[in-house]
């Protein structure tokens, strides 16, 4: 079928937004009144991954622009990274599994948990201005909770 | 060689739990995820839920209150409980293996057990 | 939950004949569909995956075709061995589905 997506912004839970830092980095920090707008929008897609009644599997795209964030091995640590795709292929239903992020939502906030590497997630610093990246801790000094704003 | 051989009771009460085990060989339980699907007799294929090689589970909306599937992956089994039975249980129950090619076909399934019967009545 | 419709529900049909099954499914899938065959007494055996990908082993006169909602199982000559009930499964979205089985009878 062919893929559903949304559009949204992502904040962790101490509120900060995520930007641009460079062509190929996210980092987060707190953004307020006409800042907001430098906030990255992203594509969600439901895609084909792992579901479970509790997981739905997800690809993170950035709106208007051919990049995804992706799950890597360098030097042997798990890494995100934003990738440089085909837009004439994606997205599609059936990423590729460095692509796919299990979707978690528990108490209203969401985590995002990478399907290649399990129990790695989409985390922040506690530090403003610090790049976004693959933590593989929950409930430590690192953020992995977020909400999600939908744009139109 | 791939294989997977259901077992369990063949006669459960109304009211009580049914339970099978589905003991696989050929393929890791930590690699590939493991379905169960039904059969009434004489009638078609439903499908009951899967259990994924990380231990995450899908389980069909209709049953979901009353299902468990879980694995011991070091014993290659896989174990169904399905509560509060009723007369509308009673059928042939299969595991089959999901394929699991990412990007390709993850949700079908190739290899299928025999099946076992199992009829619920007092 | 994505609604399968399989016909016929059952078939007569000779040795030698051409036998055409079809499913539609309630939404668009791709070519995320697979054909089972199954047997008196006997678990499914996969036939065609993928919509048309043929399974390793299965005899070439088998085959599959379609995608989006509409989908086409044939059998090019039927040979004894083919009496049986066969079944498509949506394999595009969770719940998985099945068609309610198309059975092939001897004429």
């Known amino acids: 079928a062919p893929v559903r997506s949304l559009h949204c912004t992502l904040r962790d839970a101490q509120l900060k937004s995520l930007v641009m830092s460079g062509p190929y980095e996210l980092k987060a920090l707190h953004l307020q009144g006409q800042d907001l707008e430098q906030q990255v929008v992203f594509s969600m897609s439901f895609v084909q991954g792992e579901e479970s009644n509790d997981k739905i599997p997800v690809a993170l795209g950035l709106k208007a622009k051919n990049l995804y964030l992706s799950c890597v091995l360098k030097d042997d640590k798990p890494t995100l990274q934003l990738e440089s795709v085909d837009p004439k292929n994606y997205p599609k239903k059936k990423m590729e599994k460095r692509f796919v992020f299990n979707k978690i939502e528990i108490n209203n906030k969401l985590e995002f948990e990478s399907a290649q590497f399990p129990n790695w997630y989409i985390s922040t610093s506690q530090a403003e201005s610090m790049p976004v990246f693959l933590g593989g801790t929950r409930g430590g000094q690192d953020i992995t909770d977020f909400t999600m704003q939908f744009v139109s | 060689e791939v294989q997977l051989q259901e077992s369990g009771p063949g006669l459960v009460k109304p009211s009580e739990t049914l339970s099978l085990t589905c003991t696989v060989s050929?393929?890791?339980?930590?690699?590939?995820?493991v379905s169960w699907i039904r059969q009434p007799p004489g009638k078609g294929l439903e499908w009951i839920g899967l259990?994924?090689?990380?231990?995450?589970?899908y389980y069909n909306s209709p049953l979901k209150s009353r299902l468990t599937i879980s694995k011991d992956n070091s014993k290659s089994q896989v174990s169904l409980k399905l509560s509060s039975v009723t007369a509308a249980d009673t059928a042939v129950y299969y595991c089959?293996?999901?394929?699991?090619?990412?990007?390709?076909?993850?949700?079908?399934?190739?290899?299928w057990g025999q099946g076992t019967l199992v009829t619920v009545s007092s | 939950d994505i609604q399968m419709t399989q016909s016929p529900s059952s078939l007569s049909a000779s040795v030698g004949d051409r036998v055409t099954i079809t499913c539609q499914t309630s939404?668009?899938?791709?070519?995320?569909l697979n054909w089972y065959q199954q047997k008196p007494g006997k678990a499914p055996k996969l036939l065609i995956s993928?919509?048309?990908t043929l399974w390793p082993g299965v005899p070439s006169r088998f085959s599959g075709s379609g995608s989006g909602t509409d989908f086409t199982f044939t059998i090019s000559s039927l040979q004894p061995e083919d009496f049986a009930t066969y079944y498509c499964?949506?394999?595009?979205?969770?719940?998985?589905?099945f068609g309610q089985g198309t059975k092939l009878e001897i004429k």
């Open positions: 089959a293996k999901q394929r699991n090619l990412w990007a390709y076909d993850l949700y079908g399934m190739d290899y």
């Open positions: 050929g393929f890791s339980l930590s690699e590939f995820g």
């Open positions: 259990i994924w090689g990380g231990g995450d589970t």
């Open positions: 939404q668009d899938i791709d070519m995320d």
């Open positions: 993928q919509g048309s």
């Open positions: 499964l949506q394999t595009d979205s969770f719940p998985l589905t």
